[in-house]
């Protein structure tokens, strides 16, 4: 009894359908035993479906119920299941078992990982620190959702409109900025990307003089 | 004919450290997930920690997290548990088990007693 | 965790009777509920699987239906072999967990 995945790694958006690919092959004609699916991640396992060869009676993890479809060839060769309405809480590693009792009592299996990709939110910006002549202050850029995860990248553009160079690394965050002046006026945009989508965010800095304690 | 043989248990001081050894024949072990259960003295079953087929994910039970290890050899065939900082409370009989697609702990082994005390 | 609820804890039952010992969960676990039997310096043995599948080699006395939540095992007619303590077990995900258990005893 062998057991293989196609692909060891399968990407697919939020909110679509992805087909996990397994098949078996065996000499074994009166097949009894199970396919299985579960998916591993490093906080626990759980069962996904187990299919028996027997009763061909299908068996759902809570989370699959009217979610996952076997294929129709289960029992010919192919153990791939379709997974519909994709979420965040589906990525992770899914492993394919086909157990036969008369091959030996052989248990074989692979394993494939998915990838739910999400585009990012648009990021939240924001300044921490004091927006005052010669302070320092932090420029932050976050996106709540993005599957991979979002790289963000800083540009900046004075009172004229132009754009100037950034005298630190434009990529990460947050952005820091030492030392504000006048010249540091003018407004910082973020980018925040992944292999889906883009969203972007600005931020306006315009540094107040400090204020005189008489 | 498929066996679990298990070794390694008997009689540990509080804080101390125990290996387990379960040594599986008759079915291809590296294909299967591997399982500890144990029954404490008058208690029931209580499920301690699991092993992928590979040996790449371990699963524990709250009790046990971060004091015991559970590991394989699938060359050797043999299924492990590394108990350390043991306390009374892990005082038990301990079973290795296998377990396979639809039909978990479907083969035990006869199990090994462990006891904690000073 | 899942936690699983059996009851009676304890049964008194005669040879020839009908028995049934129910298990809860906390939360829907599916079909993944197995059902095993356990008697003293022995090794457990798994009766039934996905909630209603008997174990090869196990008599078909033994039966267990339920989804979701509630589950039973039925021991159709007593054997005196059958004297020993039973546990379902939820295989759903892990951390897998057992019921207390159900010791049945000869009355």
């Known amino acids: 009894l062998t057991v293989e995945t196609t692909q060891d790694i399968l990407r697919a958006a939020r909110g679509r359908s992805v087909t996990l690919p397994c098949t078996y092959n065996t000499y074994v004609s009166d097949r009894e035993g199970f396919i299985q699916w579960d998916k591993l991640l490093r906080s626990q396992t759980e069962r996904v479906v187990t299919w028996n060869f027997v009763t061909k009676k299908y068996i759902y993890g809570n989370r699959y119920e009217n979610r996952v479809r076997v294929s129709n060839d289960a029992e010919l060769s192919n153990a791939s299941i379709t997974i519909d309405q994709l979420t965040m809480d589906d990525n992770g590693t899914y492993e394919c078992s086909v157990s036969l009792m008369s091959d030996q009592d052989v248990n074989a299996k692979s394993r494939v990982r998915l990838l739910v990709l999400v585009p990012p939110s648009k990021p939240d910006c924001s300044i921490q620190g004091e927006m005052v002549i010669g302070n320092n202050i932090q420029l932050t850029c976050h996106s709540a959702e993005g599957s991979p995860s979002p790289q963000y990248s800083w540009k900046s553009y004075n009172a004229q409109n132009q754009q100037r160079p950034l005298t630190q690394p434009v990529s990460g965050e947050p952005l820091l900025l030492k030392n504000i002046s006048t010249e540091t006026a003018g407004y910082y945009i973020c980018t925040s990307s992944n292999d889906v989508g883009i969203e972007s965010c600005n931020i306006t800095v315009a540094p107040r003089p400090p204020s005189m304690n008489i | 004919q498929m066996q679990l043989v298990q070794s390694g248990g008997g009689l540990v001081k509080p804080g101390g450290s125990l290996r387990l050894s379960c040594a599986a024949s008759?079915?291809?072990?590296?294909?299967?997930?591997m399982n500890w259960v144990r029954q404490a003295p008058g208690k029931g079953l209580e499920w301690v920690s699991s092993i992928s087929s590979s040996g790449d994910f371990m699963y524990y039970a709250d009790s046990v997290k971060g004091r015991f290890t559970i590991s394989r050899d699938n060359a050797k065939n043999s299924l492990y548990l590394q108990m350390s900082s043991l306390r009374a409370e892990d005082t038990a009989v301990y079973y290795c088990?296998?377990?396979?697609?639809?039909?978990?702990?479907?083969?035990w082994g006869q199990g090994t007693l462990v006891t904690v005390s000073s | 965790a899942i936690q699983l609820t059996q009851s009676p804890s304890s049964l008194s039952a005669s040879v020839g009777d009908r028995v049934t010992i129910t298990c809860r969960a906390s939360?829907?676990?599916?079909?993944?509920l197995n059902w095993y039997q356990h008697k003293p310096g022995k090794a457990p043995k798994l009766l039934i699987y996905?909630?209603?599948s008997l174990q090869s080699g196990v008599p078909s006395r033994f039966s267990g239906s339920g989804s979701g939540t509630d589950f039973t095992l039925t021991i159709s007619s007593l054997q005196p072999e059958d004297f020993a303590t039973y546990y379902c077990q939820q295989s759903h995900n892990t951390p897998y967990t057992f019921g207390q258990g159900t010791k049945l005893e000869i009355k």
């Open positions: 939360q829907s676990i599916s079909s993944f």
């Open positions: 088990a296998r377990e396979g697609p639809g039909t978990p702990f479907d083969y």
């Open positions: 996905v909630a209603s």
């Open positions: 008759g079915f291809t072990f590296s294909s299967y997930n």
